[in-house]
């Protein structure tokens, strides 16, 4: 699996952001597809679970992302994106997107470095 992300994303505190992750695979996409999103905080703390998808989306039941994340992917479009709501400054860090599409299960994990800022500084802001 090859993963494509925006790598760097800047978004304003309190807004929502789409963490875009798309992929390609030598295998046709089917029900075996899984997507795992995790978060590495800027301070180097432990990696945290953000989201999991396998046929259905699985929201986190607890933790910082509870009730603040939703699936915005579409397997037919080779899209594994999520929406992160009500951004906070402590959401700063690296988000990883891992896609497995058996038998195609290898490949580099996609990364997005999210910077949550006070105001828009340039046109790299990616809304909804």
């Amino acid at each position: 699996v090859e993963i494509y992300t925006s790598r760097v994303l800047e978004a304003v505190n309190g807004t929502d952001a789409r963490l875009k992750c798309t992929f390609s695979s030598f295998a046709p996409v089917g029900d075996a597809l899984t997507v795992t999103w995790n978060f590495r905080p800027l301070d180097g703390g432990p990696e945290q679970f953000v989201f999991y998808y396998h046929i259905d989306p699985f929201q986190p039941m607890s933790g910082r992302f509870k009730d603040r994340v939703s699936w915005d992917g579409n397997p037919e479009r080779y899209d594994a994106s999520i929406l992160l709501w009500k951004l906070q400054f402590d959401d700063n860090g690296t988000y990883t997107c891992q896609v497995k599409n058996p038998p195609d299960v290898d490949g580099v994990i996609g990364e997005i470095r999210l910077s949550v800022v006070h105001t828009v500084r340039f046109s790299e802001i990616h809304f909804l």
């Epitope: 925006s6 929502d16 875009k20 798309t22 998808y53 046929i55 259905d56 989306p57 929201q59 009730d67 994340v69 939703s70 699936w71 915005d72 579409n74 037919e76 479009r77 929406l83 709501w85 046109s123 802001i125 990616h126 809304f127 909804l128």
Partner: antibody, heavy 114, light 107 residues
Framework: EVKLVESGGGLVQPGGSLKLSCAAS????????MSWVRQTPEKRLEWVAY????????YYPDTVKGRFTISRDNAKNTLYLQMSSLKSEDTAMYYC???????WGQGTSVTVSS | SIVMTQTPKFLLVSAGDRVTITCKAS??????VAWYQQKPGQSPKLLIY???NRFTGVPDRFTGSGYGTDFTFTISTVQAEDLAVYFC?????????FGGGTKLEIK
């Protein structure tokens, strides 16, 4: 086969209300964000509303914000659009669409006129 | 709102011709652009997503390209059944916006 069937359109007076429905089949409805898009009589396309999976966070353009409400019932595989304080400029064909527009229904016509 | 300026508005071509439609965004939209085909009396149908990816079942005569603000949609060899209106759309930034459409007519 993905199928989206809209209903609920009709003729309504300015200031009136209408509720549109979209029955979805052929895919796992709860796993997809959903949208409403309208097409004016001049054939211009306008995005009207968007609802996420899960808790169903909603988004609207300023033209309909505060007047239109998108909602979903995953148990019934149905998407809704509640429209109130309707204006003549809301006259259009209303389509529901899966995700960011990969499949569209056949549309339901809304006419706002006295 | 991001404005999507689509040109031309009308195209009159012969079967077998190559057709190009362009869409210019008023600010960068990355590659978050889709192209739709709407045949008379029908709803829009997705042809291209993420600027260059052909959707399921779309013939390979339809192609898209571009990044940032400038996008192009091409039909390499027009066929009679391609008579339709074609729209571009950006979904990079809310509110999502569409181009004004290009009506393709066959001589």
């Amino acid at each position: 086969e993905v199928k989206l069937v809209e209903s609920g359109g009709g003729l309504v007076q300015p200031g009136g209300s209408l509720k549109l429905s979209c029955a979805a089949s052929g895919f796992t409805f709860s796993s997809y964000t959903m949208s409403w898009v309208r097409q004016t009589p001049e054939k211009r396309l306008e995005w009207v509303a968007y609802i996420t999976t899960g808790a169903g966070r909603t988004y609207y353009p300023d033209t309909v914000k505060g007047r239109f409400t998108i909602s979903r019932d995953n148990a019934k595989n149905t998407l809704y659009l509640q429209m109130s304080s309707l204006k003549s400029e809301d006259t259009a064909m209303y389509y529901c669409a899966r995700h960011r527009g990969d499949y569209w229904g056949q549309g339901t016509s809304v006419t706002v006129s006295s | 709102s991001i404005v999507m300026t689509q040109t031309p508005k009308f195209l009159l071509v012969s079967a077998g011709d190559r057709v190009t439609i362009t869409c210019k965004a008023s600010q960068s939209v990355s590659n978050d652009v889709a192209w739709y085909q709407q045949k008379p009396g029908q709803s829009p149908k997705l042809l291209i997503y993420y600027a260059s990816n052909r959707f399921t079942g779309v013939p390979d005569r339809f192609t898209g390209s571009g990044y940032g603000t400038d996008f192009t949609f091409t039909i390499s060899t027009v066929q009679a059944e391609d008579l339709a209106v074609y729209f571009c759309q950006q979904d990079y930034s809310s509110p999502w916006t569409f181009g004004g459409g290009t009506k393709l007519e066959i001589k």
